[in-house]
């Protein structure tokens, strides 16, 4: 689920935007895989990647830059 797409009906929260990261619909959704931007308190959470927020679980999640792995993209992928 590391890939993200733009969606025109997302209230301005568009995947790929540096500030917003991933799409969040205006209506509350409980399905897994529904993301919004991370709270700004997590701006340094992802070491080598970008942060997105799992809405249903209220948890941050990292989408790692190429060549990095780990929950916070903190490790170099030796197999990359």
């Amino acid at each position: 689920d590391g890939n993200s797409t733009r969606s025109p009906e997302t209230n301005g929260l568009l995947c790929g935007d540096p500030e917003e990261n991933c799409a969040a619909t205006t209506t509350q959704s409980k399905r897994k895989g529904h993301f919004s931007r991370c709270p700004k308190q997590y701006k340094h959470y992802c070491i080598k990647g970008r942060c997105r927020f799992v809405v249903a679980e209220q948890t941050p999640s990292c989408v790692c830059d190429e060549g990095y792995i780990g929950a916070r993209c903190e490790r170099v992928d030796l197999f990359y």
């Epitope: 969040a24 709270p39 700004k40 308190q41 997590y42 959470y45 809405v55 209220q58 941050p60």
Partner: antibody
């Protein structure tokens, strides 16, 4: 059931320090963020700072930076808030509050009973 | 810091009334907002988290809505035990900040 039990009321002189404790039971203490929130008589709620699990350290509101220290002792499941250079405006009820998140500071779902700190000469 | 402004600061209502409290953030906070109820001499109690999610054990007459900068707490039918002070709180960024509170009194 999570419970946060705070230490008793304190009366302090201006210029002195106070250390309030908050003992947790019924949950995994080290997993959650503990914050301290104060409330002056007849006033609203004011976040002072808190320990952020993913950072492994405390973050403080600028207003209290340099005057407040928030620590935790995992062996006793107790959090502490020490406020120094006390002045009369610091007279307030001090609450510890647990964040609902094991990552950062989100909603405060459990609160201590409050500790009244009175600063008076 | 993100400023949170509640309105009204106080209101008088009767049992059975529909009550609406608003909270405005000084900048967009997405839906990173919580609502609390506080009674005199007691610690605050979490009612709503993430703008619209009802905390476990909280009566369904409480509801929250909004995103961005404007948020609303609604009590659909005010009960005697609902007379209290209500606070909003943002958790988008440090420092966490609260609204100044809205006191709901008996008319």
């Amino acid at each position: 059931q999570v419970q946060l039990v705070q230490s008793g009321a304190e009366v302090k002189k201006p210029g002195s320090s106070v250390k309030v404790s908050c003992k947790a039971s019924g949950g995994t203490f080290s997993s959650y963020a503990i914050s301290w929130v104060r409330q002056a008589p007849g006033q609203g709620l004011e976040w002072m700072g808190g320990i952020v699990p993913w950072m492994g350290e405390a973050v403080y509101a600028q207003k209290f930076q340099g005057r407040v220290t928030i620590t935790a002792d995992e062996s006793t499941s107790t959090a502490y808030m020490e406020l120094s250079s006390l002045r009369s405006e610091d007279t307030a009820v001090y609450y510890c509050a647990r964040s609902s998140s094991t990552y950062g500071i989100h909603a405060f779902d459990y609160w201590g009973q409050g500790t009244l700190v009175t600063v008076s000469s | 810091d993100i400023q949170m402004t509640q309105s009204p600061s106080s209101l008088s209502a009767s049992v059975g009334d529909r009550v609406t409290i608003t909270c405005r953030a000084s900048q967009s906070i997405s839906n990173f907002l919580n609502w609390y109820q506080q009674k005199p001499g007691k610690a605050p109690k979490l009612l709503i988290y993430a703008a619209s999610n009802l905390q476990s054990g909280v009566p369904s007459r409480f509801s929250g809505s909004g995103s961005g900068t404007d948020f609303t707490l609604t009590i659909s039918s005010l009960q005697p035990e609902d007379f209290a002070t209500y606070y909003c709180q943002q958790y988008d960024d440090f420092p966490m900040t609260f609204g100044q509170g809205t006191k709901v009194e008996i008319k």
